[in-house]
């Protein structure tokens, strides 16, 4: 069993290395920024990311492209729930520095949890998406 788990871990590692999770990150950032825009946040605030949603994109245009590609990538993990969880964790880690404040972080986490379901995939049962140490946030 230990041998099988080791092989599973290796397979997951190589799957993660070949996955392009950027479209998922973009899709989620678009979602939470669109929500914020409707609450009066300045949609023209600058961003470090060359592919971060433009004010035009944030209104929904181009969003389906990120979602479609994101779902294709997550679909590759459908047979391995633990690996799917690791992919979600990686998305959370990659974006944590770009999330401004606790509220945005919680919102991103909430959208991230819903992502597999949004793609018509099974969501991992237990998946810890907490980035900083301290209280663990259970799936």
């Amino acid at each position: 069993r230990q041998q099988w788990e080791l092989q599973g871990d290796r397979r997951c590692q190589s799957q993660l290395e070949r996955a392009n999770l950027r479209p998922c990150e973009q899709h989620l950032m678009q979602k939470i920024q669109r929500d914020e825009d409707s609450y009066g946040r300045d949609p023209y605030s600058p961003s470090q990311d060359p592919y971060s949603p433009s004010p035009y994109d944030r209104r929904g245009a181009g969003s389906s492209q990120h979602q479609e590609r994101c779902c294709n990538e997550l679909n590759e993990f459908e047979n391995n729930q633990r690996c799917m969880c690791e992919a979600l964790q990686q998305i959370m880690e990659n974006q944590s520095d770009r999330l401004q404040g606790r509220q945005q972080e919680q919102q991103f986490k909430r959208e991230l949890r819903n992502l597999p379901q949004q793609c018509g995939l099974r969501a991992p049962q237990r998946c810890d998406l907490e980035v900083e140490s301290g209280g663990r946030d259970r799936y």
């Epitope: 070949r18 973009q26 592919y51 590759e76």
Partner: antibody, heavy 123, light 108 residues
Framework: EVQLVESGGGLVKPGGSLRLSCAAS????????MNWVRQAPGKGLEWVSS????????YYADSVKGRFTISRDNAKNSLHLQMNSLRDADTAVYYC????????????????WGNGTTVIVSS | EIVLTQSPGTLSLSPGERATLSCRAS???????LVWYQQKPGQAPRLLIY???TRATGIPDRFSGSGSGTDFTLTISRLEPEDFAVYYC?????????FGQGTKLEIK
């Protein structure tokens, strides 16, 4: 050397079938999404079909949907396109292309192409 | 389906001149999913630009891509004899992954 070599093209009558193959070498085939793109004589490029690394997501152009089937065999480093109910309009050079992405920023692109195999549908 | 319309259909210029090729989408395309390819007669297409503005490995810096939303541009700052070819834009964000009809760049 990274290489894609298509084969299986030829002359076929309308309504007939043909199976194209693409042999990959010089890279880890199972790490990449793959595509078929075609070009009719004197015309532009037309995307035909794509398949993800583990064959879990497959797409087709409307013009071939229900007639063409894309598949891959990662153990044999090969990509296939089964073409049924062929029409005159399917006459083209068929290219096999590897899809990669920029690891740091995410954009996808087809960076390696075969030289193509010619399919002629004519009575 | 996202339709990409390239203009002009044919562009006649001399070596040393600047070429501006346009690609217009029927609906917004995220920069992440806009690609440019070059094709010479009897050859397979060659990747030029991806992500709307990033040059592929080995592509000279006289080639540049720009634009966003529905309007994208490929610019060749100073044409070299080997640049005369057909250029295609493609979107690969939404299936079907459509190509533009191409712009033929010919020697004047």
């Amino acid at each position: 050397e990274v290489q894609l070599v298509e084969s299986g093209g030829g002359l076929v009558k309308p309504g007939g079938s043909l199976r194209l193959s693409c042999a990959a070498s010089g890279f880890i085939f199972s790490d990449y999404n793959m595509n078929w793109v075609r070009q009719a004589p004197g015309k532009g490029l037309e995307w035909v079909s794509s398949i993800t690394r583990s064959s879990r997501t497959i797409y087709y152009a409307d013009s071939v949907k229900g007639r063409f089937t894309i598949s891959r065999d990662n153990a044999k480093n090969s990509l296939h396109l089964q073409m049924n109910s062929l029409r005159d309009a399917d006459t083209a050079v068929y290219y096999c292309a590897r899809e990669d992405f920029d690891v740091s920023t995410g954009p996808y692109y087809m960076d390696v192409w075969g030289n193509g195999t010619t399919v002629i549908v004519s009575s | 389906e996202i339709v990409l319309t390239q203009s002009p259909g044919t562009l006649s210029l001399s070596p040393g001149e600047r070429a501006t090729l346009s690609c217009r989408a029927s609906q917004s395309v995220s920069n992440m999913f806009l690609v440019w390819y070059q094709q010479k007669p009897g050859q397979a297409p060659r990747l030029l630009i991806y992500g709307a503005s990033t040059r592929a490995t080995g592509i000279p810096d006289r080639f540049s891509g720009s634009g966003s939303g529905t309007d994208f541009t490929l610019t060749i700052s100073r044409l070299e004899p080997e640049d005369f070819a057909v250029y295609y834009c493609q979107q690969n964000g939404n299936s079907p992954y459509t190509f533009g009809q191409g712009t033929k760049l010919e020697i004047k």
